[in-house]
């Protein structure tokens, strides 16, 4: 979970505990079981550039 | 440019333990996945894991999970696998994969692979 | 687990000709998101496995355009157009939808 008194994610991203910090949504493109990407599920990514794995 | 370079061949004996070391360079070591890969002798790909180095999050295979344990030194952007009670059937080449999580990602980078063979 | 498997596993070749494997998914590849986490590999002899196709269709950076895949949700190919002498090597299939990460079999290619 996100550290009590931290800002949210802005807008197109969420949050990752595995990373430790806030992530582009559009990056569930690349690998979609991130574990940042249940939190992206609700809202639309931002513009993306589809590329590799 | 982006390498990942791994330590050297090992030969272990039965019931040892063996720490396999892949050295990062060429990017933000704490930024990408480390994956693990094992290749049997002529044999195919079986992952064991993956450690994202900043927090030392870890995922393993089920097969894998208290064989291998995988840690990271994000001072000399180094991955570590370490196998224990090893068995003639932990004989193989350990691969260290970089894995991403980003869409402006081009490609994967692997390291050139360890030899462990287990013997008496 | 999703499983993957391959086929052929032997797959001789004559250099010009075209190859073709095929790669099967236990689960359907294809996310919410309309892609299909289908990824191809070639494993050189003595080498790393290097990324040949990425999102069932997508040529990696670097790999000639005689490669190309296809497929739908479970059944996949990977085309050769006209084989070089230095496509020999394992083919891998794999997908990246979730953990844990699954390869097939390999298919052996090799020149005839």
């Known amino acids: 979970e996100q550290a009590p008194g931290t800002a949210p994610c802005s807008r197109g991203s969420s949050w990752s505990a595995d990373l430790d910090k806030c992530m582009d949504c559009a990056s569930c493109r690349a690998r979609p079981h991130s574990d940042f990407c249940l939190g992206c599920a609700a809202a639309p990514p931002a513009p993306f550039r589809l590329l590799w794995p | 440019q982006v390498q990942l370079v791994q330590s050297g061949a090992e030969v272990k004996k039965p019931g040892a333990s063996v720490k396999v070391s892949c050295k990062a360079s060429?990017?933000?070591?704490?930024?990408?996945?480390i994956a693990w890969v094992k290749q049997a002798p002529g044999q195919g790909l079986e992952w064991i894991g993956e450690i994202y180095p900043g927090t030392g999050r870890t995922y393993y295979s089920e097969k894998f999970r208290g064989k291998a344990t995988l840690t990271a030194d994000t001072s000399t952007s180094t991955a570590y696998m370490e196998l224990s009670s090893l068995r003639s059937e932990d004989t193989a080449v350990y691969f260290c994969?970089?894995?991403?999580?980003?869409?402006?990602?081009?490609?994967?980078?692997w390291g050139q692979g360890t030899l462990v063979t287990v013997s008496s | 687990d999703i499983v993957m498997t391959q086929s052929p596993l032997s797959l001789p070749v004559t250099p010009g000709e075209p190859a073709s494997i095929s790669c099967r998914s236990s689960?359907?590849?294809?996310?919410?998101?309309?892609?299909?986490?289908l990824y191809w590999y070639l494993q050189k002899p003595g080498q790393s496995p290097q990324l040949l196709i990425y999102q069932m269709s997508n040529l990696a950076s670097g790999v000639p355009d005689r490669f190309s895949g296809s497929g739908s949700g479970t059944d996949f190919t990977l085309k050769i157009s006209r084989v070089e002498a230095e496509d020999v090597g394992v083919y891998y299939c794999a997908h990246n939808l979730e953990l844990p990460w699954t390869f097939g079999q390999g298919t052996k290619v090799e020149i005839k």
């Open positions: 994969a970089r894995r991403t999580i980003y869409y402006d990602y081009d490609g994967d980078y």
């Open positions: 060429g990017y933000t070591f704490t930024d990408f996945i």
């Open positions: 689960k359907s590849l294809l996310h919410s998101n309309g892609i299909t986490y």
